[in-house]
Interface confidence: low
């Protein structure tokens, strides 16, 4: 396929990846399902330096990113290495937490509004941030 | 222990705006959803929508077209308006937190007349 | 949307008797249900959450069973404060759907 040069329209360019925004909400498989969609994934955050330029364009405000611990362990969506990798949860925080009695514990990561990482139910419908690699293949090479 | 106080006009006739307030006390107001949920008279409950403090939403299809939730979080308070009422929106209308719907608000009746 | 079935829609029993109130619904919600009891001019209270834990300050005679598609809420012993209207309530999927409700009258 093809090599993606820039960003499409309407995404911001930073450090070679395209982030899209999102400005409404969706459950987190919904989110993630989106940004497929775009050949792309829910935003994976693997320095300091990315986290603050994603928490800057999101604000105050509750936005799933692509880590979820539904099948096991946590796992990033790019396959990138959890246990090795950037982390900011908030203390005391990934917790599971049952109490809220809604079915289950809480499986999927989100930054809160300081944008320190929480994890919570995947049914809400937070906002979510879309990313995918400059230079990265556009579309899946066929296969041989 | 957590306390929600719902209150707004009781009568409307047809086509008014029904406007309704909860206000949350105890507990977290940010932590959670914050749900509106009606049941006409003698008949069952209908879930309507839900906000959480950052403004994010989500409503029941067959009311969206009529439906806007909307949070206040510096009051703790939650808020629902739904326009073009007709009688068959005539129920007891009841705020109640996140979708597990662990406490409610106390009830108020809106009455659309003529 | 989910559809709830929620069954009997009314029932008559004496105090004492085991009571038993079943949902069905229309596509599995693994076990994301509650339930819920009103008296006349009141609330709902939520009884049973994730469809078989019972909330805190409910008398142990109610307890909650099932998974995917198919619940029970159970009154072991009915007394005279259970007559009541009883629904489920699913959180699986959005929009968020209630059973139609069963009432529980004295016999």
């Known amino acids: 396929g093809s090599e993606r040069t820039c960003c499409p329209v309407n995404w911001v360019e930073h450090e070679r990846s395209c982030y899209w925004f999102s400005r409404s909400g969706k459950a987190w498989a919904d989110a993630d399902n989106y940004c497929r969609l775009e050949d792309a994934h829910l935003v994976v955050v693997t320095s300091w330096e990315e986290q603050k330029f994603v928490q800057h364009h999101i604000g105050p405000v509750n936005t799933w990113m692509g880590l979820h611990d539904q099948n096991g362990p946590w796992k990033w969506v790019d396959g990138t290495d959890y246990e090795t990798g950037f982390k900011n949860w908030r203390p005391e925080q990934p917790d599971d937490w049952y109490g809220h009695g809604l079915g289950g514990g809480e499986d999927c990561a989100h930054f809160t509004d300081d944008g320190r990482w929480n994890d919570d139910v995947c049914q809400r419908p937070y906002r979510w941030v879309c990313e995918t690699e400059l230079d990265k293949a556009s579309q899946e090479p066929p296969l041989l | 222990q957590v306390q929600l106080q719902q209150w707004g006009a009781g009568l409307l006739k047809p086509s008014e705006t029904l406007s309704l307030t909860c206000a949350v006390y105890?507990?977290?107001?940010?932590?959670?959803?914050w749900t509106w949920i009606r049941q006409p008279p003698g008949k069952g409950l209908e879930w309507i929508g839900e906000?959480?403090?950052?403004?994010?939403?989500n409503y029941n299809p067959s009311l969206k077209s009529r439906v806007t939730i909307s949070v206040d979080t510096s009051k703790n308070q939650f808020s629902l308006k739904l326009s073009s009422v007709t009688a068959a929106d005539t129920a007891v209308y009841y705020c109640?937190?996140?979708?597990?719907?662990?406490?409610w608000g106390q009830g108020t009746l809106v009455a659309v007349s003529a | 949307d989910i559809q709830m079935t929620q069954s009997p829609s009314s029932l008559s029993a004496s105090v004492g008797d085991r009571v038993t109130i079943t949902c069905r619904a229309s596509?599995?919600?693994?076990?994301?249900l509650g339930w819920y009891q009103q008296k006349p001019g009141k609330a709902p209270k939520r009884l049973i959450y994730?469809?078989?834990s019972l909330q805190r300050g409910v008398p142990s005679r109610f307890s909650g069973s099932g998974s995917g598609t198919e619940f029970t809420l159970t009154i072991s012993s009915l007394q005279p404060e259970d007559f009541a209207t009883y629904y489920c309530?699913?959180?699986?999927?959005?929009?968020?759907?209630f059973g139609g409700g069963t009432k529980v009258e004295i016999k």
């Open positions: 105890g507990g977290s107001f940010s932590g959670y959803f």
């Open positions: 309530l699913q959180h699986k999927r959005y929009p968020l759907t």
């Open positions: 906000i959480n403090h950052s403004g994010s939403t």
């Open positions: 994730s469809a078989s």
């Open positions: 596509q599995g919600i693994r076990n994301d």
């Open positions: 109640a937190r996140d979708y597990g719907a662990d406490y």
